[in-house]
């Protein structure tokens, strides 16, 4: 199995650790971990194109989209590879993350290693917002925290 980790940090109180594991090269990726310091509710959760945090989370670029698709939800066929939907923070501002995704990979053309994981200010509307921004970002707003996805020990 391939194991990968991402430490999320931002300018504010949001921080977290997210783990990824893929047992087979064409199998699903398990994503789990915890993010704290969020406001209660839904927050967009995406893999972005670049593993570049030199200017903070903005330098991570747009959602990882090697198939020239529009934004969607993780269960949609019409989605960016990096579209992992939302995480949900409780009243204490903690989001316990547990996702299984069959589109991202830890190898091959959809490999997310070396790219940036971002948690956003607002809920991702999963491409259903009815405006142009929805088809690009899901109207998820600013980038609260991010980290480069790297190979774990």
């Amino acid at each position: 199995a391939t194991k990968v980790v991402c430490v999320l940090k931002g300018d504010g109180p949001v921080q977290g650790i997210i783990n990824f594991e893929q047992k087979e090269s064409n199998g699903p990726v398990k994503v789990w971990g915890s993010i704290k310091g969020l406001t209660e509710g839904l927050h967009g959760f995406h893999v972005h194109e670049f593993g570049d945090n030199t200017a903070g989370c903005t330098s991570a670029g747009p959602h990882f989209n090697p198939l020239s698709r529009k934004h969607g939800g993780p269960k949609d066929e019409e989605r960016h590879v990096g579209d992992l939907g939302n995480v949900t923070a409780d009243k204490d501002g903690v989001a316990d993350v547990s996702i299984e995704d069959s589109v991202i990979s830890l190898s091959g053309d959809h490999c997310i290693i070396g790219r940036t994981l971002v948690v956003h200010e607002k809920a991702d509307d999963l491409g259903k917002g009815g405006n142009e921004e929805s088809t690009k970002t899901g109207n998820a707003g600013s980038r609260l925290a991010c980290g480069v996805i790297g190979i774990a020990q």
Epitope: G61, R69, E132
Partner: antibody
Framework: EVQLVESGGGLVQPGGSLRLSCAAS????????MSWVRQAPGKGLEWVAN????????DYVDSVKGRFTISRDNAKNSLYLQMNSLRAEDTAVYYC?????????WGQGTLVTVSS | VIWMTQSPSLLSASTGDRVTISCRMS??????LAWYQQKPGKAPEVLIY???TLQSGVPSRFSGSGSGTDFTLTISCLQSEDFATYYC?????????FGQGTKLEIK
């Protein structure tokens, strides 16, 4: 290997119609947005239309809205462009391309000439 | 509509040269920019998307950079097969638009 092969171009009079086809192979056609992009002789590239993988959404550049219709048949791995009320300014090589927002790979193109 | 200005429209260079092609937008497009190469009588080929991501199979001598309104395609060491016309394209805002092209010719 991805292959896109356009056909259906030719000479047509102003006001006439043509239907372009694009046969796709080498990839899962039903999983991709597809687009038509045109290039007038000696000119640059102009995006014309695109269609969602399941055919449920289409977008058009303003200059062809109401005259051109993009469609697809996923069972036949085929993309189409029905062009009605053709004008001289529609004269171009028409390319089909994979993708809905940026484009590639592309077919070799088919020439449409609108002239009396 | 987002208007795009590519410069120069014609660029003369020699093999081994490093060349840059500029693409300027009428408004910011974040990182939603692609670059294409077209050889005479052939279809365009995508080189780069998302400003700087090389499409599979594209040689590493091609690179892209920029953000907001100003973007650059760089070819670090020109090869004979690189003499062609290059187009930028924005996919930030509908309708998707292309630059007018830069013809790269042998000096």
């Amino acid at each position: 290997e991805v292959q896109l092969v356009e056909s259906g171009g030719g000479l047509v009079q102003p006001g006439g119609s043509l239907r372009l086809s694009c046969a796709a192979s080498g990839f899962t056609f039903s999983s991709f947005w597809m687009s038509w992009v045109r290039q007038a002789p000696g000119k640059g590239l102009e995006w014309v239309a695109n269609i969602k993988h399941d055919g449920s959404e289409q977008d058009y550049v303003d200059s062809v809205k109401g005259r051109f219709t993009i469609s697809r048949d996923n069972a036949k791995n085929s993309l189409y462009l029905q062009m009605n009320s053709l004008r001289a300014e529609d004269t171009a090589v028409y390319y089909c391309a994979r993708g809905g927002i940026w484009f590639g790979p592309w077919g070799q193109g088919t020439l449409v000439t609108v002239s009396s | 509509v987002i208007w795009m200005t590519q410069s120069p429209s014609l660029l003369s260079a020699s093999t081994g040269d490093r060349v840059t092609i500029s693409c300027r937008m009428s408004q910011g497009i974040s990182s939603y920019l692609a670059w294409y190469q077209q050889k005479p009588g052939k279809a365009p080929e995508v080189l780069i998307y998302a400003v700087s991501t090389l499409q599979s199979g594209v040689p590493s001598r091609f690179s892209g950079s920029g953000s907001g309104t100003d973007f650059t395609l760089t070819i670090s060491c020109l090869q004979s097969e690189d003499f062609a016309t290059y187009y930028c394209q924005q996919y930030y805002s509908f309708p998707y638009t292309f630059g007018q092209g830069t013809k790269l010719e042998i000096k």
